[in-house]
Interface confidence: low
């Protein structure tokens, strides 16, 4: 139903759910910090811009007592339960910020009447794909999608020769919520991945994927998998692999594959880490001094949620708008702001996009090193390093299906 | 506005124990993670010992099997049983809290942190262990 919103007369206000059901586990207290530090900097853009006016945030805490799970298996509901104490307490900003888990978002945008722009730090899944007034600041799965049917199909590069048409996705259950999404997306029967592959077969028992490590019957050299190096030691271990055999590990929100200290262990020789572009400045920030690497990007997408209301109300502001109109609610797509750690792109249905980048593990350093960048806004590949120096024979990717010629 | 008050910090000799208590006041968050983190002169900050608010305990291997955390709900009290101390024991002991929106997971995962991040502080209580 209509809520009437705290959005008029120079007053701004900005409604975050601060949801028990999220989709990393990050103390409450970090994703304030990180708001209110988005709130300084909106303050101070505003008031450079002669703009005098006030912009605050509410924070809507969920009572925990019903959707206590803390994953985001039991967020169905909360989302619409906080929504439902917003509207009681007659206290929606001009924007919502917070569902992260795909479950609440996608509830919410379906149950609501959404006049107001939502910005949600997760809601990885396809079902949350082509919403109108859904702003997603942390990479979707569809991104992952593209890129991995781009990589499967390049078969010009020095280091890759083969076009890839199979694939094995190894998903036990146990993912986190990012890789849930993602992984699910390229299980799905009807997706973009699953559409340009001939082959595809998920594996979901450790033993499947230990056994096809070795398989001289396997139907495919790749497998994708979520999750950290720690997560692949568990599963793989010591075990000996076909020396033709590829592991993609998809790793989106972990920099510390950029440390200057990190030496990549052993068992990483035949895997091909997917991870986002490292940020310059987060490691000194004020918000980001307590977070774990991993954590970063979640905070990172609260605060940069809050410079894009920013960014969007300098705009309608300037230009004598009104703030609480449908243009408003559907205006957050299409366009680059300044984000805390440089400019921020949001496509045509107001997702993110970045610069993804696989790495490989050099033989000689036992590094890891940039092996190509892809840009999601563009759907391009970039090659880095022309000679990788790769594990696998002539330091070529093989062939997705062992014994097959060039194609 | 949250405040953490801690007492019982002393002077005991090795093989002594002590009991830390931290009063809370102002914390309203039905989820929490709470515990003792504790800095000895010239190191960074390590946790102690955290209970999250689904009764889940964390210890750090350090102290398992001589220190037990606790809580008493309706005096809003968190306490630190510390036996058979040692020299290394030696330290400032913070209690420390913070909202959490994962039970017993990320409230473990924080004894394993360096200068974990807690977003409440106590001042701090000196324990000193020494003949």
């Known amino acids: 139903s209509q809520v009437s919103q705290n959005c008029h007369n120079g007053s701004y206000e900005i409604s975050v759910l601060m949801m028990g059901n999220s989709a990393f586990a990050e103390p409450l207290k970090n994703l304030e910090d990180a708001v209110n530090e988005g709130l300084e900097i909106v303050r101070g853009r505003l008031q450079n811009a002669g703009l005098n006016v006030t912009v605050n945030a509410t924070f809507m805490y969920s009572d925990g007592l019903i959707h206590n799970s803390g994953d985001c298996r039991s967020s169905t509901c909360e989302g619409l339960d906080l929504l439902r104490k917003i509207s009681n307490a007659q206290r929606m900003g001009c924007v919502l910020i917070g569902p992260s888990c795909t479950y609440s978002t996608f509830q919410m945008y379906l149950d609501t009447e959404l006049s107001y722009p939502m910005i949600s730090a997760g809601s990885f899944g396809l079902s949350c794909d082509y919403k109108e007034t859904l702003t997603r600041l942390m990479s979707p799965a569809r991104k992952l999608m593209y890129f991995l049917v781009n990589f499967w199909k390049t078969n010009d590069l020095p280091f890759k020769t083969y076009s890839w048409s199979t694939s094995y996705v190894y998903k036990n259950g146990t993912e986190t919520e990012d890789c849930f999404w993602y992984l699910n997306a390229l299980e799905a029967s009807v997706s973009y991945f699953s559409h340009e592959l001939g082959f595809k077969v998920v594996l979901r028992q450790d033993k499947e994927f230990q056994d096809i490590l070795m398989d001289h019957n396997r139907k495919s050299n790749v497998i994708i998998m979520c999750g950290g190096p720690e997560f692949l030691y568990k599963l793989k271990g010591d075990r000996a692999v076909a020396e033709d055999i590829v592991i993609i590990l998809v790793d989106l929100f972990n920099d510390q594959y950029f440390e200057d200290n990190v030496t990549a262990p052993d068992y990483m020789k035949n895997v091909l880490v997917l991870t986002l572009s490292p940020g310059n400045s987060l490691l000194n920030s004020s918000f980001s001094r307590n977070l774990s690497p991993t954590k970063r990007d979640f905070a990172l997408a609260y605060l940069n949620g809050i410079l894009l209301f920013g960014h969007m109300l300098k705009i309608f502001l300037e230009n004598g708008e009104n703030i609480t109109t449908p243009k408003f609610a559907h205006a957050f797509r299409n366009l680059t702001f300044e984000g805390y750690d440089g400019p921020v792109t949001l496509d045509d249905w107001g997702d993110v996009d970045s610069t993804m980048v696989l790495l490989y593990t050099s033989v000689d350093t036992k590094k890891y090193k940039v092996l190509l960048t892809y840009d999601t806004h563009v759907n391009k590949t970039y090659p880095v390093d022309m000679s990788p120096t790769f594990t696998w024979k002539n330091s070529k990717l093989p062939n997705d299906i062992t014994g097959r010629g060039p194609q | 506005e949250v405040q953490l008050v801690e007492s019982g910090g002393g002077v005991v000799q090795p093989g002594g124990s002590l009991r830390l208590s931290c009063a809370a006041s102002?914390?309203?968050?039905?989820?929490?993670?709470m515990g003792w983190v504790r800095q000895a002169p010239g190191k960074e900050r390590e946790g102690v010992a955290l209970?999250?608010?689904?009764?889940?305990?964390t210890y750090a291997d350090s102290v398992k099997g001589r220190f037990t955390i606790s809580q008493d709900n309706s005096k809003n009290t968190l306490y630190l049983q510390m036996n058979s101390l040692r020299a290394e024991d030696t330290a400032v002991y913070y209690c420390?809290?913070?909202?959490?929106?994962?039970?017993?997971?990320?409230?473990?995962?924080?004894?394993?942190?360096?200068?974990?991040?807690?977003?409440?502080w106590g001042q701090g209580t000196l324990v000193t262990v020494s003949s």
């Open positions: 209970i999250a608010s689904d009764g889940t305990t």
């Open positions: 102002g914390y309203t968050y039905s989820r929490y993670c």
């Open positions: 420390a809290a913070d909202a959490v929106n994962w039970y017993g997971s990320i409230c473990a995962s924080m004894i394993r942190r360096k200068n974990p991040a807690f977003g409440y």
